[in-house]
Interface confidence: low
């Protein structure tokens, strides 16, 4: 589900770029990191793909977007939105946010300044 952004992006906007890339590897990579060796999480078989492979796939996808603070923030916000309902408690939400904010550095991208991940209307 896409959050309400209050406008339609034009053809080169970040929103359009975020729509175009596959953020699933990023979501799975972060879930793997916060779940560790726990049971498989929901529909993800977190043992099916090595975490380093998922991270590489995630970075490859993010690399398809322009490396600007705005676009990176949009991507992180969308990942948060996509996974929000799957996060079981407040601690898990905070862990997910922490890992999410570390993602750009893991991929050798610039981290967005003060990217607000509280975009889910209070659900997360």
């Amino acid at each position: 589900m896409r959050r309400e952004r209050g406008r339609q992006g034009d053809s080169s906007s970040c929103e359009r770029q975020v729509d175009r890339v596959n953020l699933k590897p990023c979501e799975q990579h972060i879930m793997q990191r916060i779940m560790g060796e726990q049971e498989q999480y929901d529909s993800y078989d977190i043992r099916s793909t090595r975490s380093s492979d998922q991270q590489q796939r995630c970075c490859d996808e993010l690399n398809e977007m322009e490396n600007t603070q705005r676009c990176m923030c949009e991507a992180l916000q969308q990942i948060m939105e996509n996974q929000c309902d799957r996060l079981q408690d407040r601690q898990m939400v905070q862990q997910f946010k922490r890992e999410l904010m570390n993602l750009p550095q893991q991929c050798n991208f610039r981290a967005p300044q003060r990217c607000d991940l509280d975009v889910s209307g209070g659900r997360c």
Epitope: R3, E4, R5, G6, R7, Q8, G9, D10, S12, S13, C14, E66, N67, T68, Q69, R70, C71, C73, R110, P112, Q113, R114, D116, D118, V119, G121
Partner: antibody, heavy 118, light 107 residues
Framework: EVQLVESGGGLVQAGGSLRLSCVAS????????MNWVRQAPGKGLEWVSH????????YYADSLRGRFTISRDNAKNSLYLQMNSLRDEDTAVYYC???????????WGQGTLVTVSS | DIQMTQSPSTLSASVGDRVTITCRAN??????LAWYQQKPGKAPKLLIY???TLEGGVPSRFSGSRSGTEFTLTINSLQPDDFATYYC?????????FGGGTKVEIK
Amino acid sequence: EVQLVESGGGLVQAGGSLRLSCVASGFKFSGSMMNWVRQAPGKGLEWVSHITSSSATIYYADSLRGRFTISRDNAKNSLYLQMNSLRDEDTAVYYCARVSSSWHTDYWGQGTLVTVSS
Amino acid sequence: DIQMTQSPSTLSASVGDRVTITCRANQSISHWLAWYQQKPGKAPKLLIYKAATLEGGVPSRFSGSRSGTEFTLTINSLQPDDFATYYCQQYDTYLLTFGGGTKVEIK
């Protein structure tokens, strides 16, 4: 025609408070992000604050956070800036401005002058 | 925060001149840059956005270009109405930053 009309400016003592308003017309206000930008006399433009269409996300300039509060009432097509603990350096013309669908700031109000005297 | 360095701060020119104003970002902002014109006592007016896209109703003598983190506003054949102050603004982040402004005055 897009119109943004600011009000609420005036002379205020240092340490005082003021609430600025901006009434929008000519576009779908409830679907637009908005900014406040200010300009001290004879100086350049300085961004103050940003608010998304649903008020879900708000940003402030570092130097103003904690003293200024941006808000909006979509039912009234209105944007607000509550300014507390005002200082001499807050003296400026305050503009409200619309953020376009392509992210840039496209329409500006005529501005309202805030003068802080010590 | 992203810093925008605009030059020159003042520019003296004559009607008919070709004028160039430069703005440099201290880090990548892609094409997220706008140019504004402001006259004394008036609100800024949008001229160009996305580095090179002319806003509707703006005369074609205004143009913008980008080379990496350096952006240029060019006014071909300066008109009497063009004497004003010009600002660049980055919007790569929500925390907008403006250049210091360039005052174009009559030589």
